[in-house]
Amino acid sequence: ELCDDDPPKITHATFKAVAYKEGTMLNCECKRGFRRIKSGSPYMLCTGNSSHSSWDNQCQCTSSAARNTTKQVTPQPEEQKERKTTEMQSQMQLADQVSLPGHCREPPPWENEATERIYHFVVGQTVYYQCVQGYRALHRGPAESVCKMTHGKTRWTQPQLICTGETEPSQFPGEEEPQASPDGLPESETSR
């Protein structure tokens, strides 16, 4: 069941999921000057069964100058560097090391993808927060949020995190000492 709204926003923090539950949607968003093609789903879907899950549908972006074409535009090398999520490469290397039943890993980037990934999460999904570069984490509890269903309505729990001051960024689960990791190695990220 889809969560009605997005995870809470924490000032000076980003969140990511370790893995995505079946039913999760990832919108096919494109960077400026490009748009998703008109044929095919407007989103990718984490689908499958308890033993194997994968992303269904493929996102494709086309030049928005050519309004009625579905030609894929191959980006120049410098354009491919535009994604702002700098930790993505290291996360993708870790992704192959773990597979949670009924979950999908972070899908690989597509050509001319937008800098921000827009997910529709499902009930039971946990996302983890960390402070952005230059801000220090003050923890009053878990720096995570879970989408829960109560009385037929979905809600996200409030992460117990405040980002303040100037220092190194805090870590997502799996990026610090092993005992600090709640779910094992991270498989994915999203930036807000």
């Epitope: 889809l2 709204d5 919108n27 407007p42 989103y43 879907l45 549908n57």
Partner: antibody, heavy 114, light 107 residues
């Protein structure tokens, strides 16, 4: 809570135009396409088109090209649809829809009558 | 354009019964199909996305299935509050198109 609040009913003359609004709340307006759907008794639901407030992209169902004009104001998180050269065929309920079809507005009833 | 057909305009059922509403697309739409419920005087409510996934708050007696061109919305243990019109929609290719609707009547 995610909500799409549409403007009130309109009674308009043939040949004129009407502009209705759809105010989004509870989510990031610029992240999601907003679509518009027409419903007439006996004619089911028809997709008019959609707009991406963040990217500025607009797609129209060819049937509604020249009839509908979609715009969005990101500062107020409001999408608009203007219908021009109104005829009795345009009398209908118009819905806005967002968040990958999950959320629908309550609808705006447009009645075209002399 | 992809034509979406709901061949049964009306279906009659009793409380506690199981009923299946069908939908056929004129071309392969994968699983890019949604189902909506519309009660009299209300706007459509999203029930199912991607052919088989329920939206939040939708009772589990509503089940979607199918892929390609043939899709089914099954309501098991029908309740009186299920009295409504049900629409399917394809969003595999533009323009998105809807079925003509199936009105569920409770005996």
């Amino acid at each position: 809570q995610v909500q799409l609040q549409q403007s009130g009913a309109e009674l308009v003359r043939p040949g004129t135009s009407v502009k209705m609004s759809c105010k989004a709340a509870g989510y990031t307006f610029t992240n999601y396409w907003i679509g518009w759907v027409k419903q007439r008794p006996g004619h089911g639901l028809e997709w008019i088109g959609d707009i991406h407030p963040g990217g500025g992209y607009i797609d129209y169902n060819e049937k509604f090209t020249g009839k509908a004009t979609l715009t969005a104001d990101t500062s107020s998180s409001t999408a608009y649809m203007q219908l021009s050269s109104l005829t009795s065929e345009d009398s209908a309920i118009y819905y806005c829809v967002s968040r990958n079809f999950a959320k629908w507005g309550q609808g705006t009833l447009v009645t075209v009558s002399a | 354009d992809t034509t979406v057909t709901q061949s049964q305009k009306f279906m009659s059922t009793s409380v506690g019964d199981r009923v299946s509403v069908t939908c056929k697309a004129s071309q392969n739409v994968g699983t890019n199909v949604a189902w909506y419920q519309q009660k009299p005087g209300q706007s459509p409510k999203a029930l199912i996305y991607s052919a088989s996934y329920r939206y939040s708050g939708v009772p589990d007696r509503f089940t979607g299935s199918g892929s390609g061109t043939d899709f089914t919305l099954t309501i098991s243990n029908v309740q009186s509050e299920d009295l409504a019109e049900y629409f399917c929609q394809q969003y595999n290719s533009y323009p998105y198109t809807f079925g003509g609707g199936t009105k569920l009547e409770i005996k």
